[in-house]
């Protein structure tokens, strides 16, 4: 059955299936792939929505998977396994039986190994830096109507604390957002940075997790702001732990 | 496809009052942020009001501010604009949208918001 026969929608995450079924007959919606029940007041964990968009039929993936040695997020096309919260588990396993580390946003922090790899535990992402590079314009946007209105998506369209965004940079025509959120910062109810970015990094390709959403619609008085480039940065707690030849490679 | 229908607009006399209601065709709008907005003749469309989904906090514009009141009912799928001393200027288009926002304020762009409804006329006349 769909949501929309169940008359019941999840606005924060339509790879869901919902149903009035809840109680009191009121709405409950469970993730495509892992059936987890998600909260519809805000944002679906990262985990959840890479299993969901793994579920999908083959033909809806557009995108294709950059270079094992990137620098940067491989877009996290894999299956994850995820803990009864939604977070993503410490070590992730292909169907071939190797193995790796990944920190809280689900990219790989070691070298890949087999079954007897240990994470002992899920490092956290504590900074994200991401970078983004605006289609050219008659002349630079203001820099501080630029960061308020990006500040106000984070607040108002993420659900992510003002006090997370720790600063937006501008020189035309790149924009860094850096957001900033501690284990000892974030507290129960807060949304994570690193699904605040994720939630970003799809509205900015056009693939809005959002009901109703085909993409984002940013403008800074009223100018249309077109991004054409976007490069996501993630720094841990903990360095990652590379062996020299990735390193050099 | 979420379909907004609003009702309760009206003709009513300077100071007096009205309640528009705006409902989902049997969706719950209970994590939607939910706007109210009017268009009076020869003007652009203007934000009135609106009631955020993560705490339900309000924001109201200036020119309706102690005299209008926003509120849901969730239950009822529905929310509400509760308007008193209406004055001449009230007179407009009145508009509900939903927008899978968390948070609502003066700066929320109209572009935010997803869903809109057609409209019911409100004419503050004596």
């Known amino acids: 059955h769909t949501a929309a026969q169940d008359n019941c929608t999840c606005p924060t995450n339509k790879m869901t299936v919902c149903s009035p079924d809840g109680p009191g007959g009121r709405c409950q919606c469970r993730a495509l792939g892992s059936g987890m029940a998600v909260d519809c007041s805000t944002l679906t964990s990262k985990c959840l929505l890479l299993k969901a968009r793994m579920s999908a039929p083959k033909n809806a993936r557009t995108l294709v998977r950059p270079s094992e040695h990137a620098l940067v997020d491989n877009d996290g096309l894999y299956d994850p396994d995820c803990d009864p919260e939604g977070r993503f588990k410490a070590r992730q396993c292909n169907q071939t039986s190797v193995c790796w580390c990944v920190n809280s946003v689900g990219v790989r922090r070691t070298d890949k190994g087999d079954l007897s790899l240990r994470c002992d535990e899920l490092v956290r992402t504590h900074h994200i830096l991401i970078d983004l590079r605006h289609r050219p314009t008659a002349g630079a946007f203001n820099h501080s109507d630029l960061d308020a209105e990006l500040r106000r998506l984070f607040r108002e369209r993420y659900r992510l604390h003002p006090k997370f965004v720790a600063a937006v940079h501008y020189e035309q025509p790149t924009i860094q957002i850096e957001l900033r959120q501690n284990t000892s910062q974030k507290a129960a109810g807060d949304v994570d940075i690193g699904d605040a970015a994720y939630y970003f990094e799809r509205d900015i390709k056009g693939e809005s997790l959002f009901q109703g959403r085909g993409g984002l619609d940013l403008r800074v008085r009223g100018e249309p702001l077109q991004v054409e480039r976007t490069l996501i940065y993630y720094l841990d707690e903990i360095p990652p732990k590379f062996s020299m030849k990735r390193l050099t490679a | 496809q979420l379909q907004l229908v609003e009702s309760g607009g009206g003709l009513v006399q300077p100071g007096g009052s009205l309640r528009l209601s705006c409902a989902a065709s049997g969706f719950s709008l209970e994590h939607w942020t939910i706007g109210w907005f009017r268009q009076a003749p020869g003007k652009e469309r203007e934000g009135v009001s609106c009631?955020?989904?993560?705490?339900?906090?309000?924001y109201y514009a200036d020119s309706v501010k102690g005299r209008f009141t926003i509120s849901r009912d969730n239950a009822k799928k529905s929310v509400y604009l509760q308007m008193n001393s209406l004055k001449l200027e009230d007179t407009a288009v009145y508009y509900c949208a939903a927008g899978s926002l968390g948070y609502c304020s003066r700066s929320t762009p109209q572009y935010e918001y997803d869903y809109w409804g057609q409209g019911t006329q409100v004419t503050v006349s004596s």
């Open positions: 009631i955020s989904s993560s705490d339900a906090s309000t």
